[in-house]
Amino acid sequence: KSSNEATNITPKHNMKAFLDELKAENIKKFLYNFTQIPHLAGTEQNFQLAKQIQSQWKEFGLDSVELAHYDVLLSYPNKTHPNYISIINEDGNEIFNTSLFEPPPPGYENVSDIVPPFSAFSPQGMPEGDLVYVNYARTEDFFKLERDMKINCSGKIVIARYGKVFRGNKVKNAQLAGAKGVILYSDPADYFAPGVKSYPDGWNLPGGGVQRGNILNLNGAGDPLTPGYPANEYAYRRGIAEAVGLPSIPVHPIGYYDAQKLLEKMGGSAPPDSSWRGSLKVPYNVGPGFTGNFSTQKVKMHIHSTNEVTRIYNVIGTLRGAVEPDRYVILGGHRDSWVFGGIDPQSGAAVVHEIVRSFGTLKKEGWRPRRTILFASWDAEEFGLLGSTEWAEENSRLLQERGVAYINADSSIEGNYTLRVDCTPLMYSLVHNLTKELKSPDEGFEGKSLYESWTKKSPSPEFSGMPRISKLGSGNDFEVFFQRLGIASGRARYTKNWETNKFSGYPLYHSVYETYELVEKFYDPMFKYHLTVAQVRGGMVFELANSIVLPFDCRDYAVVLRKYADKIYSISMKHPQEMKTYSVSFDSLFSAVKNFTEIASKFSERLQDFDKSNPIVLRMMNDQLMFLERAFIDPLGLPDRPFYRHVIYAPSSHNKYAGESFPGIYDALFDIESKVDPSKAWGEVKRQIYVAAFTVQAAAETLSEVA
């Protein structure tokens, strides 16, 4: 399925011409340009950047570039009434206060409008009480506290370390446990890699560095006030009490210098085991409360942030397709940052900018892609994927009929060790074939393919000689396209060595220290990893938009469906007695997977043999491929999560960042032994097996011969 058959082409206008036009030096220049001042969503600076990108994309040669604006709920600290946490003595005097801001990095001392660290969408409040240390505040951490250690978090302020799971899940878990406030902190065990210096001398987090971030539990809703519909000029907005996903208790993030002051006084129970100990010189006692002489001291939070409906701007660029203009391949990444956005998002935005420039150069030479390519610079991703979700809500009818694929383009790097790809199984073969054609940027792999270095450094746990490709979860702008609309999606970036660097994300994530210099000095001085990511993302878009037959292999879906069915069955089989008692059977699911496998195999055979010169048959076969992902969408959505509609994949209910397979069945089985009504609980398991089996069978039938 070569891309050389693109329209209006001379031989040079192929994938190679597109890739050769991508230049590391340009990406470097764009990154510098995008990172000199903060571009917080809803601010004038970010609006100006949107207009700059619009203007440059037009210059690069796109057919049209428009701004799409929405008025969404955002959250900001009160400029005159800062947020902080204090330790108070028995008289109510504040004997310790946390920092009000991060010490600015060298060269940025005079930059204005650096938003201080805060947890976006925290309600206002000044709770005071005893502290309980809750490790990562995961579901299993609260189970350990409540069930094993008999610690009641009700009415307590909990302190949790960042990492492992999305911060919004931590806050939700704390709320469910009855906490009245949450303090989030970065522990050096998770955000300080051994043997590396702190910024500005290295890429580690200094003690005064703090991770910002939203703490919503939107479950795909987009703007909290207009779930399901665009936040346009005539939108009906919910009252704040009915808003989706807002936390109900105050939350605030701190660095490890401040955390040390809180944790060193902790009393109560010893930590349950070493997995609860970080790297600070404190006992990591769980509490509740402070020990001995400090037992009369309490912790008090002072949170004064406000939620405000604010205008945001997406930039949408169009490169019209020559043959199938009504088929859309979308490349999108966000533009808004917490501060300078040196990695998140501008390392991604700079790559998108260079991809647009390369496509524009080809277009100016008379080339057009077969299908339409849409380029998006999303706003307000950091506030809950708002820009992408509102745009997709506004254009949902077009997207569900015309959307071929969505490629995400947030941060291009989170390390410089190897490639990391998360995508639909439909794209596995595309990614494999593309990376075999690209050169590896890795030291020691000169002259070798990217596929080879990737496979060596990140091998698949199931298939030898193949690289690991992960499930899509959420926490980024592909969410609405994949989880709600069922558009085949993928993402790629360069990552760290997960085996040797066990910290969560990269140490300076969402801090003021995420600067251009961080990237240029420590992560990618030659911008060779950025260039590789540009080639992967751009190459995927090129192939998706240009190949005559869509580069999707439905047989790979069959393989993973069987794997996921085996996995969920083995989870259920931990309860053999109940399965017998309640007549729980997975036969229907395994039968549907078997049918899918057989039908996919036959479809693939027909795909090799059909007459590609017949435009009607070609379109028919491509539509079956395009609509296969759509066939996994259940219009009713998952229980209590109506905007997560994909039956095969959803963000984990316990960690938004992670993908879960057969999420309906998984959630029905989760902690089932603790359910008060086992008959009802197992009834729900049976219902979810039925939904999954039906959906897989229905999807299989979309691949059958049409008549």
Partner: antibody, heavy 116, light 107 residues
């Protein structure tokens, strides 16, 4: 219902090793830490260490460090405690106990006798 | 290590008596103390945790109190089935440590 079933009594010679098993049932094995506590005849209970079955990481009482190894087999929902370089004073009943810091569920105990 | 010292080591009381066992920690442990009951030839059973909270199913004649270094287990009205050895345990610091036990008999 929750059950912790330990392996049977052992008689060992000084210098030998013993490995005691503890099979869990009625709950999700990986959700709860497993501890080992011993009791020599007429003596107090003595905490030896624990394992987090989810990660396989063990924490030990320094008194036994180097001699005790706690492991688990999640597929069999079983925890193991191996004590090496046995001496006569290691004669005791060895208990597995589920929990974190405090122990609500105990195995029935395994008597290990060290005698030449 | 934190030493837990119980007193008395043994005691004899009549059915219906109020019985008090004390436990002293060598350093402050806040309220991170549990009490266990062990009958001859049996495994220990959790009675009290967090110094004063009764475990599920434990009769309300058992109560605990204390914080810091001094802790007490009280049986308000001794019953024949309460004949056992009672152990305190601290879980404020590793290694977790137990008292030497108090053997309770019926007169």
């Amino acid at each position: 219902e929750f059950q912790l079933v330990q392996s049977g009594a052992e008689v060992k010679k000084p210098g030998a090793s013993v490995k005691v098993s503890c099979k869990a049932s009625g709950y999700s094995f990986t959700d709860h830490n497993m501890n080992w506590v011993r009791q020599a005849p007429g003596q107090r209970l003595e905490w030896m260490g624990l394992i987090n079955p989810n990660y396989g990481t063990a924490d030990y009482n320094q008194k036994f460090k180097g001699r005790v190894t706690i492991t688990r087999d999640t597929s069999a929902s079983t925890a193991y405690m191996e004590l090496s370089s046995l001496r006569s004073e290691d004669t005791a009943v060895y208990y597995c106990a589920r929990g974190s810091s405090l122990f609500a569920y105990w195995g029935q105990g395994t008597l290990v006798t060290v005698s030449s | 290590d934190i030493q837990m010292t119980q007193s008395p080591s043994s005691l004899s009381a009549s059915v219906g008596d109020r019985v008090t066992i004390t436990c002293k920690a060598s350093q402050g442990v806040d309220t991170a103390v549990a009490w266990y009951q062990q009958k001859p030839g049996k495994s220990p059973k959790l009675l009290i945790y967090w110094a004063s909270t009764r475990h599920t199913g434990v009769p309300d004649r058992f109560s605990g109190s204390g914080s810091g270094t001094d802790f007490t287990l009280t049986i308000s009205s001794l019953q024949p089935e309460d004949v056992a050895t009672y152990y305190c345990q601290q879980y404020s610091r590793y290694p977790l440590t137990f008292g030497q036990g108090t053997k309770l008999e019926i007169k």
